[in-house]
């Protein structure tokens, strides 16, 4: 495959509501007009697909309705948001970018973003 550089932050801390956002940036070698972005989770040497979306440049990034991911694109950057995260979801989240059209096909895989998720402490019962 023709290789492409993909950059993403090394570490991100999820919010108390279990939401983590990070930017995935790719160095497009040509006039990329259709891009596929896949988020992979690596934990205990297991790699699983979290979500994926294909978008045309200038169009919105659309994940499946039941996806835990949302995102927006701007030029060669994709702003990804993963929601519904819990402490057990802590792991390395890898951004994979494929330039689907026009040919030739390019593939780039980032080094991953370590997302730390801390479950919020349960609120103590209040006496009223």
């Amino acid at each position: 495959c023709k290789a492409m550089h993909v950059a993403q932050p090394a570490v991100v801390l999820a919010s108390s509501r279990g939401i983590a956002s990070f930017v995935c940036e790719y160095a497009s070698p040509g006039k990329a007009t259709e891009v596929r972005v896949t988020v992979l989770r690596q934990a205990d040497s297991q790699v699983t697909e979290v979500c994926a979306a294909t978008y045309m440049m200038g169009n919105e990034l659309t994940f499946l309705d039941d996806s835990i991911c949302t995102g927006t694109s701007s030029g060669n950057q994709v702003n990804l948001t993963i929601q519904g995260l819990r402490a057990m979801d802590t792991g390395l989240y890898i951004c994979k970018v494929e330039l689907m059209y026009p040919p030739p096909y390019y593939l780039g895989i980032g080094n991953g973003t370590q997302i730390y998720v801390i479950d919020p402490e349960p609120c103590p019962d209040s006496d009223f």
């Epitope: 495959c1 006039k31 059209y101 040919p103 030739p104």
Partner: antibody, heavy 120, light 112 residues
Amino acid sequence: QVQLVQSGAEVKKPGASVKISCKASGYKFTDHFINWVKQAPGQGLEWIGDINPNNGGTNSNQKFEGRATLTVDTSISTAYMELSRLRSDDTAVYYCARLRREYFYAMDYWGQGTLVTVSS
Amino acid sequence: DIVMTQSPLSLPVTPGEPASISCRSSKSLLHSNGITYLYWYLQKPGQSPQLLIYQMSNLASGVPDRFSSSGSGTDFTLKISRVEAEDVGVYYCAQNLELPLTFGGGTKVEIK
């Protein structure tokens, strides 16, 4: 159903320009690339270029670079190809075609074609 | 540019009999991602081209299963198991491994 309807036949003199339209219906216009293909009389198919309706970004066959201009008007779901500095060997049927990502970017729907005749 | 070469130029066929068309590319169309960027189109008399096969061997929606396609990285074959009268026309192979997209010269299939 998906339809690509092209403008009618044109007769032009050498050196002139021609602008062909391709009106799409039956699908969301901005979800698919539009390609343009040339077919000279009794000849095969030759790719001219493509356009992304979202941002007007184009890819072109170098053979036509500088003479073929691809544009879109998303408000009326229409793609255009303008060919300038016409020569006799531009006499051909020109097709627009939609690309489909599920078919790995094959052209799944084609217009009926527009015959352009270049003659003095 | 990738050159696509088809043979034969013309193919007289008998209805009910099998037929095959060859296509050769000047460069392997098998990408390291496992996809073969080879397509077949049919242009029936007086009509626009229509998609038959994508990714070398996959039938487009509505294409009868009497059509099949196979090949290596550079040599491809389109087969019709039993030719029907409606199959007449010019068959084109095409590639979109790289720009510019290119087509073969076409094979004209006609009834004997």
